[in-house]
């Protein structure tokens, strides 16, 4: 398990932009955290290339990643979330090039879920409901949701509604009748801690009554 | 798999320096943390320092100004020099692995003794 | 430094028989860990981050606490699990062991 490389592959490694992103998951496995870190030009090699954090930690000074094919990784519950970690690009012992980031500035939350859309006939409204991990945790608990919706014929004519609970109520006469829709959300940290866009959650498809047709509940299709 | 074997003298006249050495196999040292660890009857475990994978070392204050750990990564080895020893720094000495979790990979470990 | 101080010192139990030993920390510390020794060998991991137990370790085995506070529990004695057992704490430096727990069959 040598981290070496030939003194030919140092130089040309040194050639190659080996800008890198990373994010962090609070939580994300009962008590564990993780931080998924990955280049930004997919064509980089890493054959001989390492990512290890060193600071702010609790317990060790320094961890390095798992490799699990493009991306490399780290699953574990010793983050401090206080102060800035050193994030570095290795060969061997020689670091390329590193990035100081605070772990609590770059969360993305897990994609939210149990997606539906429940039709109020007397209301004449439309009740969307899901549910998020982040109610239960810790850390990560206050998030803002960005709900989209677009009827299915149009491709990218998406409507987006950001809010901060997990129910929306869509008003019938906003919508198209007898229109087949499409609907799925997705969060971002909202209070203290920073970040990213979580994945979006599966799709929900509705289908709008007819006007003067009494529905009750909309069935997913 | 993952082992790691200390070497060194087994005995050393009082005042002189212990060095010792940790060979590993099965883990690539520049990604992973080795910390020296003694054992003697009177004094238990005590935890002598570490060195980290980026090369930075932190010493037991105990001993830190007699104590040096390196590393030559290319032969897979970790390095211990403690200068002026004397007789209660007899011991068994072990390196391990500071893993992610604990000391989670030690050494056999190697006897040395004080004395003239 | 953080003083780990564990009792009993030395313990005799019989088969089938709970056990418990105690670590207690001069100062708050994040996580305890647990080696077990056996006399002419190294220590082995065996309870990690306070509770997690090693990989092989039987799950009659526990550990518990937070704090200053912390224990390794056998839920029922084997013959096997007599040895020294010793608490560690890498929350601040220099990190300490615990003065031992031997363990003897009854």
């Known amino acids: 398990e040598s981290g070496y490389a030939q003194n030919g592959d140092l130089e040309d490694a040194e050639l190659d932009d080996y800008s890198f992103s990373c994010y962090s998951q609070l939580e994300v496995n009962g008590s564990q955290h993780s931080l998924t870190c990955a280049f930004e030009d997919p064509d980089v090699n890493i054959t001989n290339l390492e990512f290890e954090i060193c600071g702010a930690l609790v317990e060790v000074k320094c961890l390095n990643f798992r490799k699990l094919q493009e991306i490399y990784f780290i699953e574990t519950k010793k983050f401090l979330l206080i102060g800035k970690s050193n994030i570095c690009v290795k060969v061997g012992e020689k670091s390329l090039t590193c990035k100081k980031i605070d772990l609590t500035t770059i969360v993305k939350p897990e994609a939210p879920f149990d997606l539906s859309v429940v039709y109020r006939e007397g209301a004449n409204d439309f009740v969307v409901t899901f549910n998020t991990s982040h109610l239960q945790k810790k850390y990560v608990k206050v998030l803002m949701h960005d709900v989209a919706y677009r009827q299915e014929k149009d491709e990218n004519k998406w409507t987006h509604v950001n809010l901060s609970s997990t129910k929306l109520t869509l008003l019938q006469r906003k919508l198209q009748p007898a229109a087949m829709y499409e609907i799925k959300v997705r969060s971002i940290p909202d209070h203290y801690f920073k970040g990213f866009w979580s994945e979006w959650s599966p799709s929900y498809y509705f289908r709008t009554p007819e006007i003067n047709n009494s529905s009750g509940e909309m069935d997913p299709i | 798999q993952v082992q790691l074997k200390e070497s060194g003298p087994g005995l050393v006249q009082p005042s002189q320096t212990l060095s010792l050495t940790c060979t590993v196999s099965g883990l690539s040292l520049p990604n992973n943390n080795i910390a020296w660890i003694r054992q003697s009857p009177g004094k238990g475990l005590e935890w002598m320092g570490v060195i980290w994978s980026n090369g930075d070392t932190d010493y037991n204050s105990a001993i830190r100004s007699r104590l040096s750990i390196s590393r030559d990564s290319s032969k897979s080895q970790v390095f211990l020099r403690m200068n002026s020893l004397q007789s209660e720094d007899t011991a068994m000495y072990f390196c391990a692995r500071e893993g992610m979790t604990t000391l989670d990979y030690w050494g056999q470990g190697v006897v040395v003794t004080v004395s003239s | 430094e953080i003083v780990l101080t564990q009792s009993p010192t030395t313990m005799a139990a019989s088969p089938g028989e709970k056990v418990t030993i105690t670590c207690r920390a001069s100062s708050s510390v994040s996580y305890m860990h647990w080696f077990q020794q056996k006399s002419g060998s190294s220590p082995k991991p065996w309870i990690y981050?306070?509770?997690d137990l090693a990989s092989g370790v039987p799950d009659r085995f526990s550990g518990s606490g937070s704090g200053t506070s912390y224990s390794l529990t056998i839920s029922s004695m084997e013959a096997e699990d007599a040895a020294t057992y010793y608490c560690l704490q890498r929350s601040s430096y220099p990190r300490t062991f615990g003065g031992g727990t031997k363990l003897e069959l009854k």
């Open positions: 981050d306070s509770s």
